[in-house]
């Protein structure tokens, strides 16, 4: 005879256990039904009546078949450094995991209790163990023949470029600078290229910054030697550089004199307005292989007649160290221009948000038929000291930081050559001195 199916509640056979989804109630001494996930026991069973279940209230849950008198409370809302990967429902608890760039320093049964920012390796150190959801980055010094010039939680040390003739040997935090007798790129007259310390990590491609209306522009800014961008194969020899530099300086002086004369004549100018916008990029997006259209600053030897644009740009450089500039010992910069005190020998201390620097440089090149014009070239910067995400940086607030007395029209730069192609070209990365090169 087939055994009869017992309906709850029922008394179990001596020595046997209750069936699946049933529990033994000690008071009633009967096998009773459990409540399904999302429910709890409102009334416990008796010898004659089964368990009465009720749905969990808001912000409470039960994940398993149960006979608990009250549902469990969902965990507190996810903190700002976390992402809610599973919402609180009647059947499951909220799960918080660390957002990108952070790792779980203290885990709980499900999700994470405490997130911490991934360590950033400072220049001279590279990632030797990438961070994971549950482990921090490990930084190690760059081996001989390799370098890292970034403060990053993803960049590994990279080999120095190979030079035919080395101008400046590379070290752990700087690539080698090459020199050669014949230039491998066409140069604008009156200026010498020194490649800039732009990170050229192969494994990261830089997103295209917001398009700019600027044609390829050659600013003349004084700066010291620095490591090259990838693909830079050679520069002018020193004597040629000096000659060209002196020539440029002469032209600059003539231009300034012209300016003084022109300011006397009050004629309305026809101005070509050129804007070079340097968008703020998230820290780990602001690096990558430099495309052919990306621009490098042209340089002249520093002189007493350097314009206010030069000095303000230099001041900006000093004010806002970037990931591509080697930092002073104990201080590390992250991509958004933040500086942190270093707590370790081989890596940076974790830190939050820092100062974001948005630089907008506007140069008005003025021209009128009789060469007499009066206008001011303006370079303005938008700077925000925020703890918010990059997207919340103050875009619209424009704080002028310098005004040119007059922008002269050089023979080297006619309106036609300035306008060049009207197509919009991406500018590089938020690095004040990453510069421009002729396209």
């Amino acid at each position: 005879l087939p055994a009869q199916v017992a309906f709850t509640p029922y008394a179990p056979e001596p020595g046997s256990t209750c069936r699946l989804r049933e529990y033994y109630d000690q008071t009633a001494q009967m096998c009773c039904s459990k409540c399904s996930p999302g429910q709890h026991a409102k009334v416990f069973c008796t010898k004659t009546s089964d368990t009465v279940c009720d749905s969990c209230e808001d912000s409470t849950y039960t994940q398993l078949w149960n006979w608990v008198p009250e549902c469990l409370s969902c965990g507190s809302r996810c903190s700002s450094d976390q992402v809610e990967t599973q919402a609180c429902t009647r059947e499951q608890n909220r799960i918080c995991t660390c957002r990108p760039g952070w790792y779980c320093a203290l885990s709980k049964q499900e999700g994470c209790r405490l997130c911490a920012p991934l360590r950033k390796c400072r220049p001279g150190f590279g990632v030797a163990r990438p961070g994971t959801e549950t482990s921090d980055v490990v930084c190690k010094p760059c081996a001989p023949g390799t370098f890292s010039n970034t403060t990053s939680s993803t960049d590994i040390c990279r080999p120095h470029q190979i030079c035919n003739v080395v101008a400046i040997p590379g070290n752990a935090s700087m690539d080698a600078v090459c020199t050669s007798t014949s230039p491998t790129r066409s140069m604008a007259p009156g200026a010498v290229h020194l490649p800039q310390p732009v990170s050229t990590r192969s494994q990261h491609t830089q997103p295209t910054p917001e398009p700019s209306t600027a044609p390829s522009t050659s600013f003349l800014l004084p700066m010291g030697p620095s490591p090259p961008a990838e693909g830079s194969t050679g520069d002018f020899a020193l004597p040629v550089g000096l000659i060209v530099g002196v020539t440029a300086l002469g032209l600059l002086i003539i231009g300034v004199v012209n300016c003084v004369i022109m300011t006397q004549v009050k004629k309305k100018p026809l101005c070509l307005q050129r804007e070079a916008k340097v968008p703020h990029l998230p820290a780990d997006k602001a690096r990558g292989t430099q495309g052919p259209e990306q621009q490098h600053l042209l340089i002249t030897a520093p002189s007493s007649s350097s314009s206010s644009l030069e000095s303000s740009a230099s001041a900006l450089d000093r004010r806002a160290p970037t990931r591509n500039q080697p930092q002073a010992p104990g201080v590390e910069a992250s991509g958004a221009g933040e500086a942190r005190a270093s707590t370790g020998s081989s890596d940076s201390s974790p830190g939050g948000h820092g100062t974001q620097v948005n630089v907008t440089c506007i140069v008005n090149v003025c021209s009128s038929s009789d060469h007499s014009s009066q206008c001011s070239s303006q370079a303005s910067s938008t700077m925000g000291d925020t703890d918010s995400s990059p997207s919340e940086s103050p875009k619209d607030e424009q704080v002028p930081f310098s005004k040119e007395e007059c922008a002269f029209r050089s023979q080297l730069e006619t309106p036609e050559t300035l306008l060049g192609s009207t197509e919009e070209k991406p500018l590089p990365l938020g690095v004040p001195d990453a510069g421009m090169k002729p396209s």
Epitope: V127, P130, S135, V138, K140, T146, T154, P159, S202
Partner: antibody
Framework: EVQLVQSGAEVKKPGATVKISCKVS????????IHWVQQAPGKGLEWMGR????????EYAPNFQDRVTITADTSTDTAYMELSSLRSEDTAVYYC???????????WGQGTTVTVSS | EAVVTQSPATLSLSPGERATLSCRSS?????????ANWVQQKPGQAFRGLIG???DRAPGIPARFSGSGSGTDTTLTISSLQPEDFAVYYC?????????FGGGTKLEIK
């Protein structure tokens, strides 16, 4: 000059444990991870694991996880690889190395032959 | 567990020819997080790391060696084979917390 010098060949019985040493010189041991790689006769390379001598933290390949222990002694500039529960398929040459796809610090020991035979 | 497959197992070419060695990840696309590497082994000689970070030549490695990656594959190219390039080449991919080597490609003289 950077050198990694490994201990000599070993012959072991199945079920036994072998411990190979790797003495480094010419650089600061804590600056780079030390890896252990297995190469069975006529076979390719099998990454076993690595140790960070700075803090002793290790990472192991899933296939070796249960049987391998990699350590480093900074006082003697020596790394060790211990493989337990040996079986015949563990017969191989074992290399210690500072090779790392992250650092380009590329030095290898001369290899230690371990023969597992009953 | 991740499996890294190299192809071909053997490649027979003559000096001066171009060699293309492929390495495929079983777990989907090879990303920058796999930090793809290539290692050379010559009989009776120490191993030598050639490429790191998918396409960076290690210090001292000739320019004829280059690495690239797209989709599930990472590739080692030797533009013009020299007699000393005939060896076994291994690729290695990083998976979260461990390296996995491919089975190797033997590059032999035709």
């Amino acid at each position: 000059e950077v050198q990694l010098v490994q201990s000599g060949a070993e012959v072991k019985k199945p079920g036994a444990t072998v411990k190979i040493s790797c003495k480094v010189s010419g650089y600061t041991i804590t600056d780079f991870y030390i890896h252990w790689v297995q190469q069975a006769p006529g076979k390719g390379l099998e990454w076993m694991g690595r140790v960070d001598p700075e803090d002793g933290n290790t990472e192991y390949a899933p296939n070796f996880q249960d049987r391998v222990t990699i350590t480093a002694d900074t006082s003697t500039d020596t790394a060790y690889m211990e493989l337990s529960s040996l079986r015949s398929e563990d017969t191989a040459v074992y290399y210690c190395s500072t090779w790392d796809g992250f650092s380009y610090f590329d030095y290898w020991g001369q290899g230690t032959t371990v023969t597992v035979s009953s | 567990e991740a499996v890294v497959t190299q192809s071909p197992a053997t490649l027979s070419l003559s000096p001066g020819e171009r060699a293309t060695l492929s390495c495929r990840s079983s777990t989907g696309p090879v990303t920058t997080n796999n930090y793809a590497n290539w290692v050379q082994q010559k009989p009776g000689q120490a191993f030598r790391g050639l490429i790191g970070g998918t396409n960076d030549r290690a210090p001292g490695i000739p320019a004829r060696f280059s690495g690239s990656g797209s989709g599930t594959d990472t590739t080692l190219t030797i533009s013009s084979l020299q007699p000393e390039d005939f060896a076994v080449y291994y690729c290695a991919l990083w998976y979260r917390n461990h390296w996995v080597f491919g089975g190797g490609t033997k590059l032999e003289i035709k």
